[in-house]
Interface confidence: medium
């Protein structure tokens, strides 16, 4: 017995919008830069990423998560908003590129944010010329903040166990959606083998309909892979990436985007202090 | 609902240390932040400070900084402030406000010889 | 630090009354502005947030506006209720958020 494609359609809808529902949870961060988008060489910029109360975690990734950065000193922004900001004090071209943020807010992490175009010039004004473009952002507008320094950047957090759960929930659902769908061209085959239809509309239907359902799960995966499982690499540690991951490891030296995670407008002396660690290594999965 | 329980009056000797506190409740403490705010009698309203009690990290009005530390613990859902080198220009009422949209009862503190 | 000068310090005002106060940065505050409510022997109550946004449960007589460096706090239709001192306080630039030296609405 086979079944039903309208079934299996509704099956896939469903996971689609199960999927979707989780997404549409947490708002999505906005990014901007300070003071602009196009920074002369030699120049500071700072990025806020913003979003909701209650963010635990801001990410700013870069060119699409091969490196990234997280803080956990999250600045109120305002009764309903919350903010980081990441600093880089002497920009160099290796620094231009798409930069966006993330964040986690318990129990899960958002969706990224817009990218946002770091563009860097050469400056005959030298490192404090205002030739900047005025602050840009990728999502509403933003504002200075929090003069003080970030004091350091803790590693990315683990993989979630609600996380895994839903991961294994969706991936065995998808799994089964697929082997039904497999099964069924295969019964639909063996039909058509066996014999003419009976209508000309008859030949077509079959074939529209698993059709819909392979877009339709097909754009639900994408939902997945955006949102969902690339988590599994963001958030896994690296030290257990290196130990033994089935995974090949690369260690990029991120001396160019030494980012000094401290605020726009130093004003104690105390923000003049370096991180712990300038020249950071960012463990990346290679599959 | 949300509460923000304030420890009671204080009164002090200038050159002590006091600490207040704001137990909260109704609410996942760590993922709001805990701001404190002074009022003299018949003046108004002056920011502290903040913490964020989820990462520790705290931001001081300047003029604050050698004056309170804040503090905050996880496990009883309680932010404190500590005043040390009282004076008597310390005597006031202290309010814990969560985020600025929920305000605690206010601790008065009273510094005396 | 970002200074917040309101007007006028004290007011009276009749019931069912239009009353506004006003709120002046010394910069561009960006909208980043909230109104605190304080009634006589109170605690403070935070009524608008983004310089327009009514806090949940706060009344829609309460009402706030402005840009830059100017906002304003409107009562549309004053109750015995409303009577007490309110504050502006910014936090476009902190620390340290700062507060207006308050309004004080006394009922005629």
């Known amino acids: 017995m086979s079944p039903h494609p309208t079934a299996l359609l509704g099956l896939v809808l469903c996971l689609a919008q199960t999927i979707h529902t989780q997404e549409e949870d947490l708002p999505r961060p906005s990014i901007s830069a300070e003071p602009g988008t196009v920074i002369p060489l030699g120049s500071h910029v700072t990025f806020v990423c913003r979003g909701p109360v209650g963010v635990q975690t801001f990410r700013l990734e870069r060119d699409s998560r091969s490196t990234y950065n997280d803080t956990e000193d999250v600045s109120q922004a305002s009764p309903s908003e919350s903010e980081a900001r990441f600093r880089i004090d002497s920009v160099r071209e290796g620094n231009a590129g798409l930069y966006r943020c993330i964040y986690y807010k318990p129990p899960k992490w958002s969706e990224q944010s817009d990218y946002l175009e770091l563009l860097v010039k050469e400056s005959s004004g030298g490192p404090d010329s205002p030739d900047t473009e005025p602050g840009s952002s990728a999502g509403p507008t933003q504002r200075p903040s929090d003069n003080s320094h970030n004091e350091h950047a803790p590693a990315s957090q683990g993989l979630k166990a609600e996380h895994l759960y839903i991961l294994i929930g969706v991936s065995v659902v998808f799994l089964f959606c697929l082997l039904l769908l497999v099964l069924f061209c295969l019964h639909r085959q063996n039909q058509i083998k066996q014999g003419p239809p009976r209508s000309k509309d008859e030949e077509q239907k079959p074939q529209q309909r698993p059709d819909l359902a392979v877009d339709v799960l097909e754009r639900t995966a994408d939902k997945a892979t955006v949102n969902g499982l690339p988590e599994k690499d963001r958030e896994t540690d690296t030290s257990a990436l290196a130990a033994g991951s089935s995974q090949e490891v690369t260690y990029a030296q991120l001396d160019h985007w030494a980012l000094t995670q401290r605020t726009a407008r130093a004003v104690s002396p105390q923000s003049t202090k370096p991180m712990a660690e300038s020249i950071t290594y960012a463990a990346v999965a290679r599959h | 609902q949300v509460q923000l329980q304030q420890s009671g009056a204080e009164l002090a000797k200038p050159g002590a240390s006091v600490k207040l506190s704001c137990k909260a409740s109704g609410y996942t403490f760590t993922s709001y932040w805990m701001h404190w705010v002074k009022q003299r009698p018949g003046q108004g309203l002056e920011w502290i400070g903040y913490?964020?009690?989820?990462?520790?990290?705290?931001k001081y009005n300047q003029k604050f900084k050698d004056k309170a530390t804040l503090t905050a613990d996880k496990s009883s859902s309680t932010a404190y402030m500590q005043l040390s080198s009282l004076t008597y220009e310390d005597s006031a009422v202290y309010y814990c406000?969560?985020?600025?949209?929920?305000w605690g009862q206010g601790t008065t503190l009273t510094v005396s010889s | 630090d970002i200074k917040m000068t309101q007007s006028p310090s004290s007011m009276y005002a009749s019931l069912g009354e239009r009353v506004t106060i006003t709120c002046k940065a010394s910069q561009d505050i960006n909208s980043y502005l909230s109104w605190v409510q304080q009634k006589p022997g109170k605690s403070p109550k935070t009524l608008i947030d983004r310089a327009n946004r009514l806090v949940d449960g706060v009344p829609s007589r309460f009402s706030g506006s402005g840009s830059g460096q100017d906002y304003s706090l409107t009562i549309s239709s004053l109750e015995y209720e409303d009577m007490g001192i309110y504050y502006c306080l910014q936090y476009d630039e902190f620390p340290p958020y700062t507060f207006g030296g308050g309004t004080k609405l006394e009922i005629k």
């Open positions: 913490i964020n009690p989820f990462s520790g990290h705290t």
């Open positions: 406000a969560r985020n600025f949209d929920q």
